[in-house]
Amino acid sequence: MGGKQRDKDDEAYGKPVKYDPSFRGPIKNRSCTDVICCVLFLLFILGYIVVGIVAWLYGDPRQVLYPRNSTGAYCGMGENKDKPYLLYFNIFSCILSTNIISVAENGLQCPTPQVCVSSCPEDPWTVGKNQFSQTVGEVFYTKNRNFCLPGVPWNMMVITSLQQELCPSFLLPSAPALGRCFPWTNVTLPELPGITNDTTIAQGISGLIDSLNARDISVKIFEDFAHSWYWILVALGVALLLSLLFILLLRLVAGPLVLVLILGVLGVLAYGIYYCWEEYRVLRDKGASISQLGFTTNLSAYQSVQETWLAALIVLAVLEAILLLVLIFLRQRIRIAIALLKEASKAVGQMMSTMFYPLVTFVLLLICIAYWAMTALYLATSGQPQYVLWASNISSPGCEKVSINTSCNPMDQPVNSSCPGLMCVFQGYSSKGLVQRSLFNLQIYGVLGLFWTLNWVLALGQCVLAGAFASFYWAFHKPQDIPTFPLISAFIRTLRYHTGSLAFGALILTLVQIARVILEYIDHKLRGVQNPVARCIMCCFKCCLWCLEKFIKFLNRNAYIMIAIYGKNFCVSAKNAFTLLMRNIVRVVVLDKVTDLLLFFGKLLVVGGVGVLSFFFFSGRIQGLGRDFKSPHLNYYWLPIMTSIMGAYVIASGFFSVFGMCVDTLFLCFLEDLERNDGSLDRPYYMSKSLLKILGKKNEAPPDNKKRKK
């Protein structure tokens, strides 16, 4: 590509940055940016707080704090004054049916009878086979097991009381938490006599039997976590150290590592080509053609025709060719990318505090989510409680004629019913009154608030890190010229001057994300519709919005870097970042892909390392460890392994997101440096010697011939 042509291309994306003798890295003298958006954001937050207060005032905090029995009466109040705890007949059915939406709408309701009790059961117990024919009085009341629903006759047969779900068929040693009786973590469920694997115990404990054969999985999970939490923390510590080590060692091994990874990808593609060729050759010799197959929606059928493998072969060959050409013609750009990665590793090493900034982001995100969840929960519990008819198993004989979900009076339980276990249970809250009528709008406001605040917190993190890393790049003498507290000063600077700009960027992203959520909701509602045109249009819309979100995230990220450096408003920063990147589009693509490859490998290394270590440790395959390092005895050894792996992934993602931000910031600074400076005494380059060497440039030596120390 000729120089003139390049100049023309560059002109299309604005003029290169002019030299500014006063520029010394992140501008000190700034003014507030995007003030209107800042005011709008602060007003919105104020509104969000008002919504929270309204939710708190109109919501029923007792619904969250106090448990309710099956009739909707509060435990520990009124008629249940001496019975403060709620006992679930089959708590496992709660685990199987609880999700964030049901909790937000109904509180902690479960599809199992619930009764207020004066104390939680202390011993494990199950109705014995020989007790089914006894009386409720003999089995429950005389044994101080006062856990039946109120009003169950003393001389009622136990079996019929269980079938009607008037009494619990088993009890677990429980401790009160949140006013509810929750099983102890190390409890072993007693055997359920007289129950074979092919018959289920009545609806009250069907979930229990199905999932476990008389010993529920969740109890075992609690046990396992109780035994292995310490070692999971150790595994997460290893993940933390591995992530740090990988980033810090990049300055030494980035070059060879990138080369090995690229060759690895080439090798994988080459093997893919070979495999596709072999499959194609075999099927061609057999004469297995697509014309014989005809049209089919069974995708696996396409594996047995030669055209499939030929197409795959062509695609892989094209990718291989592209990668080889990139390797040959863009090796200079790859070398720049490697040098920038090394530089980023140095930057992180100089400012180790940046590695732990994700913790701040995490805490802020947690606050945003918790505030939204509480507000949503309290909004959902505003209004009068409503009750509906409900049965645990509506397919039982006698339940056909019952109108499930019709409203009822909880004080008048439906005893005159042919449907076993039919009850009048709490469903939700009515929508009478101004707050209740505006409930949907307030919840929408809350969701908007959630997305906007989350995106703002993430934007804050990006801008703060960009400010810190930019101060590293633009320090002429490293580390002497780096500010004392780069992260803290960047944080204060960002909050003080650029809240509005971050809010602007976050709002744009929020609107796209909300549009995507609405689209997903519509798609979910249209799942049943088999109209291929509608499905296709929906798919296109979703794809476009996904791409738009990706682009906006990319643009925002670079805009925040520019804001951190120059302190201009969002639009100017976004434009400058975009034009700067477009003037260097090939470098952008190469760096982006090389960084992606490297960070993917880093995550793989951390997660894989922790995974392998966890596997060998928790499965007891590591022999000869001391008594202090003995692996715990577990029901499911894969549980702590999976927890360790997921934790390691979160930790690695946190660290590498900082590193990624560092690379992006240094890259933008590097491009600015190239355009702003020329290596003369007046305008020296700020980049490292290795980058200068790769570009074939150098800084003029000062008259006294003393080389500047980098």
Partner: antibody
Framework: QVQLVESGGGVVQPGRSLRLSCAAS????????MHWVRQAPGKGLEWVAV????????YYADSVKGRFTISRDNSKNTLYLQMNSLRAEDTAVYYC??????????????????WGQGTTVTVSS | DIQMTQSPSSLSASVGDRVTITCRAS??????LAWFQQKPGKAPKSLIY???SLHSGVPSKFSGSGSGTEFTLTISSLQPEDFATYYC?????????FGPGTKVDIK
Amino acid sequence: QVQLVESGGGVVQPGRSLRLSCAASGFTFSSYGMHWVRQAPGKGLEWVAVIWYDGSNKYYADSVKGRFTISRDNSKNTLYLQMNSLRAEDTAVYYCARDRYSGYDYYYYYGMDVWGQGTTVTVSS
Amino acid sequence: DIQMTQSPSSLSASVGDRVTITCRASQVIYNYLAWFQQKPGKAPKSLIYGASSLHSGVPSKFSGSGSGTEFTLTISSLQPEDFATYYCQQYTIYPFSFGPGTKVDIK
């Protein structure tokens, strides 16, 4: 097929004792609960007692409590009703009946299904 | 103890008639109610359990309904062999108890 045959009925003086037996065949006796039901001449049915499959749980009508004892011998497939301190009002046809609940079927409780032909007890001085 | 009452105590009907017998319990017995048929000089025969489920071999002209405290037995089309006394029985609360019976005779 399932069959229940009562025996041991007869004429007895008030205050005396009598033991009724019910021989079962055609099913696994030890798995089922068994009842005694009586019917006074020209009157309706009256439930007397029940014994569950393993003999551990027994329940009686208030009118016979303390005087009658229900028992079973699973090895002989036989149900018994030991009647002490008999009264004139105990005069009736005594039926044994099988309870459909076997102790294994938790899911539903059906009550009585199969009845014997009955044995007559007459309490008279 | 639970008292069971039946109405009517007796009824006269013709062959082909639809007959309904009502049984009431003094307290809630859910659907733990059985119906028995007894002919003079014979042992009772089980017809219905669980208020509405037919024992095997019982013709479908017999049907039961109700729950809680009020129950009915219906014979959709009365046949000569159906003239007998019908008893209801609760079997959930000890002592189990029978209703006084309803005698169905030929009009």
